[in-house]
């Protein structure tokens, strides 16, 4: 509801506005009600971030946001007597939080993470421009199912990139994937400016490759049956089936959005299995098939990360060259 009467005079400002950080990237502002507010006013609080984004009118005396603390962020808060956005709130009080100190050129860049097969997360980053080449990095991570911030132990080097991987298994809790993983990278010596990232669990998901179970010919059609990677249901995946013919040296790629095993030629009721029929394939030549998968937007925000290709499987016979 809209609360009680809305006196015409402006309410006093909120008091004791303070800001703190929880976990790695959860910023929380709290405040106290204004002193000397009208007795017939049902207090609501108007707040928005410094760039006038995310306006909110709510009765709670706190507001939080999950944000990578790579830049200064400010919240302005005012009080008012109704939920009406057109009502002029009190004088707005502002409280800002700045990122940790340090030379911005020393902070790591290109910090990104990929959730591999919904079982482990692999993050990688580039050293900052003003960083000694022998800098030792540490990655910290936190997500909702952890009680405290964890330090990633498996630091590796891959070309010019540093990285670290940690276990992150999809839990049955249906809301798990609606959350994010909070990441921070800094150096052991405390010389570089820390870098933060927030990885939504519905993006940057890379499935394992599928496993081809069976290839068979029926007339001039090639029936392909494969097992999807663990942890994924078939309706959440798109597929690419590549068929190479040794005789004609043709290379056909089929983009498959639905891969149901409804045709009688396919083995039925096999858990987590998908199927596709490749039309017009010559049975008396050698055909080599491989498949890759990616998440789709039915279940995930991101649909750009293909799995690696499956192992190849061949069917037919190689013709002797004459």
């Amino acid at each position: 509801g809209g609360g009680g009467a809305a006196p015409t005079e402006t309410q006093p400002p909120v008091t004791n506005l303070s800001v703190s950080v929880e976990n790695l990237c959860t910023v929380i502002w709290t405040w106290n009600p204004p002193e000397g507010a009208s007795s017939n006013c049902s207090l609501w609080y108007f707040s928005h971030f410094g760039d006038k984004q995310d306006k909110k009118i709510a009765p709670e005396t706190r507001r939080s946001i999950e944000v990578p603390l790579n830049e200064r962020i400010c919240l302005q808060v005012g009080s008012q007597c109704s939920t009406n956005e057109s009502e002029k709130p009190s004088i707005l009080v502002e409280k800002c939080i700045s990122p940790p100190e340090g030379d911005p050129e020393s902070a790591v860049t290109e910090l990104q993470c990929i959730w591999h097969n919904l079982s482990y997360m692999k993050c990688s980053w580039l050293p900052g421009r003003n960083t000694s080449p022998d800098t030792n990095y540490t990655l910290y991570y936190w997500h909702r199912s952890l009680e405290k911030i964890h330090q990633c132990e498996n630091i590796f080097r891959e070309g010019q990139y540093f990285g670290c991987s940690f276990d992150l298994t999809k839990v049955k809790d249906s809301s798990f994937e609606q959350h994010s993983v909070q990441i921070m990278v800094k150096d052991n010596a405390g010389k570089i400016k820390p870098s933060f990232n927030i990885v939504p669990l519905t993006s940057r998901v890379k499935p394992d490759p599928p496993h081809i179970k069976n290839l068979s010919f029926h007339n001039d059609d090639l029936y392909v049956q494969w097992e999807n990677p663990q942890n994924f249901i078939s309706r959440c995946l798109f597929y690419e089936v590549e068929v190479n013919n040794s005789q004609t040296e043709t290379h056909n790629v089929f983009y498959v959005q639905e891969a149901k095993c409804e045709n009688p030629e396919f083995e039925r009721n096999v858990e987590n299995t998908s199927c596709f029929m490749v039309p017009g394939v010559l049975p008396d030549t050698l055909n080599t098939v491989r498949i890759r998968v990616k998440t789709n937007k039915l279940c995930y925000e991101d649909d750009k990360l293909w799995s690696n290709w499956s192992q190849e499987m061949s069917i037919g016979k190689k013709r002797n060259s004459t």
């Epitope: 421009r129 000694s132 080449p133 080097r157 010019q160």
Partner: antibody, heavy 119, light 107 residues
Framework: EVQLLESGGDLIQPGGSLRLSCAAS????????MNWVRQAPGKGLEWVSV????????YYADSVKGRFTISRDNSKNTLYLQMDSLRAEDTAVYYC????????????WGQGTLVTVSS | DIQMTQSPSSLSASVGDRVTITCRAS??????LAWYQQKPEKAPKSLIY???SLQSGVPSRFSGSGSGTDFTLTISSLQPEDFATYYC?????????FGQGTKVEIK
């Protein structure tokens, strides 16, 4: 075996544009920084530009900033240098060089391609 | 920018000689220095990185030393194929800079 093969060098008039390419093979292209280094006739080496493995981060020498653009196509294992507003002093052999890691030395070099800016 | 100064600019030596080239940085660069060899009409070749680490495949007669501002490349026993121009390069801070080169000629 690591191989870097530059192409695209030519004789060009001042103010003109040119695009150099560098085809890479023999290593995992998308995890290494790639550089352009040039050498004017009879002179020493001058670093021109670098691009990170994913192609997100780029840096330039002051002498080419705003005129040259470095880019890469990781699907083709190819590095590029787009050169605009060319000047006589850009005349040089342009080498592409693989970074051994990020802010580091160059462990492999191409054979170079000659760019001549003259009217 | 960090200036790199090599000395000498050129030198004449005989096969079997011990040759030393120095490189001085205008400010401290820790050990972040590389050495390259370049033969006429050829691309440079990496010899040494991190001041003293030998690039794989480079003969052990090449060695590097130094840290901070003063660095040395030493060829313990000069071979016919070593006649070339040698460059140092700092990678402590952007932009990367090279020395002007030292030409090693046959006496």
């Amino acid at each position: 075996e690591v191989q870097l093969l530059e192409s695209g060098g030519d004789l060009i008039q001042p103010g003109g544009s040119l695009r150099l390419s560098c085809a890479a093979s023999g290593f995992t292209f998308n995890i290494y920084a790639m550089n352009w280094v040039r050498q004017a006739p009879g002179k020493g080496l001058e670093w021109v530009s670098v691009i990170s493995g994913r192609g997100i981060t780029t840096y330039y020498a002051d002498s080419v900033k705003g005129r040259f653009t470095i880019s890469r196509d990781n699907s083709k294992n190819t590095l590029y240098l787009q050169m605009d507003s060319l000047r006589a002093e850009d005349t040089a052999v342009y080498y592409c060089a693989k970074g051994s890691s990020y802010w580091t030395d160059f462990d492999y070099w191409g054979q170079g391609t000659l760019v001549t800016v003259s009217s | 920018d960090i200036q790199m100064t090599q000395s000498p600019s050129s030198l004449s030596a005989s096969v079997g000689d011990r040759v030393t080239i120095t490189c001085r940085a205008s400010q401290g660069i820790s050990s972040w220095l590389a050495w390259y060899q370049q033969k006429p009409e050829k691309a440079p070749k990496s010899l040494i990185y991190a001041a003293s680490s030998l690039q794989s495949g480079v003969p052990s007669r090449f060695s590097g030393s130094g840290s901070g501002t003063d660095f040395t490349l030493t060829i313990s026993s000069l071979q016919p194929e070593d006649f070339a121009t040698y460059y140092c390069q700092q990678y402590n801070s952007y932009p990367w800079t090279f020395g002007q080169g030292t030409k090693v000629e046959i006496k």
